[in-house]
């Protein structure tokens, strides 16, 4: 019997390389059984995840699965960074793993690390 | 059920290149990592690196970088790898290994591909 | 890179009679989420690895309950309680909490 408590799915240590100036949509995949309950995004500024109160979110609703989207129109340079969804569920918080956008300045596009440059940096080690 | 199938063994010279496929039913890659493991004869086990397929996302252990590559087509629910100038060191038996959603635990295994590297 | 350090190299061991393998790691692996991606593997002969045991004591299914994973930080440990023919093979633990991801050297349990 499959669990009627809310998951997030967002993978554990995931991460996005994106250009600034570019449109992206940060998706929370969300399982709920009746009720879809409330969530939101936050960004992790050290050991807090501060709540993104003024940004635009919005739903997508598929077969299975729901999506709360975090929507970036567009990606601006101080958008790098871990990013966290949460959910509360009867009376719970459940917070997903944190997921990291690496953004690139099209500015210096031409010095663009490649996706595995960025990957071993030392500040990735998940500590 | 899940299955991860892999392509079948491989004889090839070195300073060749030769690319390993995994296909996998029962789960949609896109929710998983798909990782690579070299085992060469009689040895331990030694993680390559990993994919994301939802984003193409990559991650490897240094040591492989420049001589491991790997890719991943959601459409057809399959990950590759791609090793490089190829020398009897990479003689191995290569697994790929499947996260369910992407938890990073190693939950599904392939049955493992044997690459020999010989002139 | 985290260096994972199993002992002994081969045990050998009486069917029936327990057997307890060693993992220490060059680094505490309890991860900021609190949990420790530390796991067992089993490796029989000719065979791929079967996971036996992930986040250091949670069993997988299927795996009988004579397994038990325990430790926290750095130092860990698998116990057999009653080793049964099955269980011959090699073990390797596997930490998961930094890049790169690493494996012991493994453990051949074998009988006397």
């Known amino acids: 019997k499959e669990s009627c408590d809310v998951q997030l799915y967002i993978k554990r240590q995931s991460e996005h390389s994106i250009l600034a100036g570019d449109p992206f949509e940060l998706e929370c995949p969300v399982k709920y059984c009746a009720n879809r309950p409330h969530v939101t995004w936050c960004k992790l500024n050290g050991t807090t995840c501060v709540k993104l109160e003024d940004r635009q979110t919005s739903w997508k609703e598929e077969k299975n699965i729901s999506f709360f989207i975090l929507h970036f129109e567009p990606v601006l340079p101080n958008d790098n960074g871990s990013y966290r969804c949460s959910a509360n569920f009867q009376s719970n918080l459940i917070e997903s793993h944190s997921t990291t956008l690496y953004v690139t300045d099209v500015k210096s596009a031409s010095e663009r690390p490649s996706k595995d440059e960025m990957a071993s940096r030392p500040w990735l080690l998940y500590r | 059920e899940v299955q991860l199938q892999q392509s079948g063994a491989e004889l090839v010279k070195p300073g060749a290149s030769v690319k390993l496929s995994c296909t996998v039913s029962?789960?949609?890659?896109?929710?998983?990592?798909i990782h690579w493991v070299k085992q060469r004869p009689e040895q331990g086990l030694e993680w390559i690196g990993r994919?994301?397929?939802?984003?193409?996302?990559?991650k490897y252990d240094p040591k492989f970088r420049g001589k491991a590559t790997i890719t991943a087509d959601a459409s057809s629910n399959t990950a590759a790898l791609q090793v490089s100038s190829l020398t009897s060191e990479d003689t191995a038996v290569y697994f790929c290994?499947?996260?369910?959603?992407?938890?990073?635990?190693?939950?599904?295994w392939g049955h493992g591909t044997t690459l020999t590297v010989s002139s | 890179e985290v260096v994972m350090t199993q002992t002994p190299l081969t045990l050998s061991v009486t069917i029936g009679q327990s057997a307890s393998i060693s993992c220490k790691s060059s680094?505490?692996?309890?991860?900021?989420?609190?949990?420790?991606?530390l796991n067992w593997f089993l490796q029989r002969p000719g065979q791929s690895p079967k996971r036996l045991m992930h986040?250091?004591?949670k069993l997988d299914s299927g795996v009988p309950d004579r397994f038990t994973g325990s430790g926290s930080g750095t130092d860990f440990t698998l116990k057999i309680s009653g080793v049964e023919a099955e269980d011959l093979g090699v073990y390797y633990c596997?930490?998961?909490?930094?890049?790169?991801?690493?494996f012991g050297g493994g453990t051949k349990l074998e009988t006397k």
């Open positions: 290994v499947g996260d369910h959603y992407g938890s990073s635990l190693f939950d599904y």
């Open positions: 596997w930490q998961g909490t930094y890049f790169p991801y690493t």
């Open positions: 029962g789960f949609n890659i896109k929710d998983s990592y």
């Open positions: 994919i994301d397929p939802a984003n193409g996302n990559t």
């Open positions: 680094q505490s692996l309890l991860d900021s989420d609190g949990k420790t991606y």
């Open positions: 986040l250091v004591s």
